[in-house]
């Protein structure tokens, strides 16, 4: 499906610092339009980051995710690629966008509705670029406080884009780039794999996925500093960014009839985004079923209420 | 405080199956990707794979793929390695561990349990 | 795979001794290298992380080094409890890879 636009609807001004190759699982490149160059990254815990083209680190993991990306369709996979405009495969959650980006809304004249639809075990796992894709993790944030040389140096706090729900393998991101070789948007890889059959009270997961590839200190107390992160036992852990009054798990683990109502307020192009925890108590929506949501046209950032169903409850312990 | 707890020693024949837990307590369990690590006598370390809890996208070493599964229970905040098709190279000592950064900062592991030993001898 | 290559397998050395120990990765590894140290028995202790970051509670007489694919542990001047194996490991691709280790034993 080809755009006849490819407005520019991803805004990079910061740019990421490096993050392992190992905790990514696709990468695209914003639109030519866009004037400065980008290459957006996803991390394994569907987290979307700004990064310079030119930096060796993201020529090097482009290049292994291309290669992941070969093995797969080498491996009996499909891979099909597409071209348009760059648009997230669901709702971006605005709570982890940056201050220096800016979503535009869509410009093709479609509705700019999201809706994603729900995917299978099989599904979940077919998609993306490399074997790697963990689409399938739903309210597991990994994020805490980074250590403290890594947030001051500008690493990846506060460069976040938002976090893609993993709910839907159906939505594809599309690339306006052409000339962009191999896997560099979205796709669809279909492997042979079966999802797993084990017992799900034990949240199995088995070997028969493709793969291409503490110091627990026996006496004391661990005493937390600089270089290592607390573990909050009954906190929510979220990540708030900046003047933006959502949360980058805003689409974590929704329950059925979940709704997310996105509005626009001014972002700020100062000010460090802070990751603190969030006291228990707060709820965290399910990531089972689909989102919907409206984009507000008149766009400087995103703010999203998410409006729970009943059943809304704390995901942590 | 952060602890793994693992199981004891193992004793299996070539062909068995072994399953190894990992009892996870001071934090959240469902939030921190569990690792499993080999270690064979004399040896170096050996990266199994990782596995969230809650989460059914594990990634494995390839050396160790087919063989192995990465399970949890997330009531009892326990992790569990499997491992099947035993043999005599298969002993060693297996360790759980976690990554304890921010997911864009990488899998260097802080927190190790204390280590199970898996003899595989007929 | 990213294979890493530590140097020397062993190493000899006294109370005080400054000693340093490579690791070599196959490939860049954009300074993704963590430092472990392994007593007989227990499991591995972190001891450095990511562009050289002292892991919470190591002295501050280790330090690392390096860039590109050459990375470096020192121990400025090795205390007793120093003697022990030490292991690299990159964590910037996966399967994640570990030094094939050095051992550390007193002269």
């Known amino acids: 499906q080809h755009h006849g636009v490819t407005k520019c609807n991803i805004t990079c001004s910061k740019m990421t610092s490096k993050i392992p190759v190992a905790l990514l699982i696709h990468y695209q490149q914003n639109q030519a339009s866009c004037g400065k160059r980008a290459i957006i990254l996803e991390t394994r815990q569907h987290r979307l980051f700004c990064a310079d083209p030119k930096e060796q680190w993201v020529k090097d993991a482009m290049q292994h995710l291309d290669r992941q990306a070969a093995a797969l369709t080498r491996n009996g996979g499909t891979f099909e690629k597409q071209i348009g405009e760059v648009k997230p495969r669901t709702t971006p959650a605005a709570g982890g966008m940056d201050e220096s980006v800016v979503l535009e809304p869509e410009a093709t004249g479609e509705s700019s509705s999201l809706e994603p639809t729900p995917s299978s075990q099989e599904a979940q796992r077919a998609l993306g670029t490399s074997p790697e894709l963990p689409t399938g993790v739903t309210g597991s944030s990994g994020t805490r406080l980074p250590p403290t040389p890594k947030a001051q140096d500008g690493g990846p706090v506060g460069t976040e884009l938002f976090r893609v729900p993993p709910v839907s393998t159906a939505a594809t991101w599309q690339s306006s780039a052409p000339h962009q070789p191999g896997p560099s948007l979205w796709a669809e890889a279909k492997t042979s794999e079966a999802p797993s059959t084990q017992d799900p009270s034990t949240q199995a997961s088995t070997a028969s996925s493709p793969a291409p590839e503490e110091n627990a200190p026996s006496e004391g107390q661990r005493v937390w500093g600089q270089g290592q992160s607390p573990r909050p036992e009954n906190s929510l852990e979220r990540e708030e960014m900046g003047p933006v009054p959502a949360h980058t798990d805003a689409f974590q683990d929704w329950g059925p009839g979940s709704m997310a109502h996105v509005s626009v307020v001014p972002v700020s192009s100062e000010g460090t985004p802070s990751r603190e925890p969030v006291a228990s108590g707060s709820w965290t929506p399910k990531a089972e079923e689909p989102i919907h949501a409206t984009m507000d046209p008149q766009r400087l950032g995103v703010l999203i209420t998410p409006v729970p169903d009943a059943q809304a409850a704390t995901r942590r312990q | 405080e952060v602890q793994l707890v693992q199981s004891g020693a193992e004793v299996k024949k070539p062909g068995a199956t072994v399953k190894i837990s990992c009892k996870a307590s001071?934090?959240?369990?469902?939030?921190?990707?569990i690792h499993w690590v080999q270690q064979a006598p004399g040896k170096g370390l050996e990266w199994m794979g990782w596995y969230l809890p809650g989460d059914d996208s594990p990634k494995f070493n390839e050396r160790f793929k087919g063989r192995v599964t990465i399970t949890a229970d997330k009531s009892t905040n326990t992790a569990y390695m499997e491992l099947s098709s035993l043999r005599s190279e298969d002993t060693a000592v297996y360790y759980c561990?976690?990554?304890?950064?921010?997911?864009?900062?990488?899998?260097?592991?802080?927190?190790w349990g204390q280590g199970t030993t898996l003899t595989v001898s007929s | 795979d990213i294979q890493m290559t530590q140097s020397p397998s062993s190493l000899s050395a006294s109370v005080g001794d400054r000693v340093t120990i490579t690791c070599r990765a196959s490939g860049r590894i954009h300074d993704f290298l963590a430092w472990y140290q392994q007593k007989p028995g227990k499991a591995p202790k972190l001891l450095l992380y990511t562009d050289n970051t002292l892991a919470e509670g190591v002295p501050s007489r280790f330090s690392g080094s390096g860039s590109g694919t050459d990375y470096t542990l020192t121990i400025s001047s090795l205390q007793p409890e120093d003697f022990a194996t030490y292991y690299c490991q990159q964590f910037w691709s996966t399967p994640y890879t570990f030094g094939g280790g050095t051992k550390l034993e007193i002269k």
């Open positions: 561990a976690t990554s304890p950064t921010d997911e864009t900062q990488g899998d260097y592991f802080d927190y």
């Open positions: 001071g934090y959240t369990f469902t939030n921190y990707y």
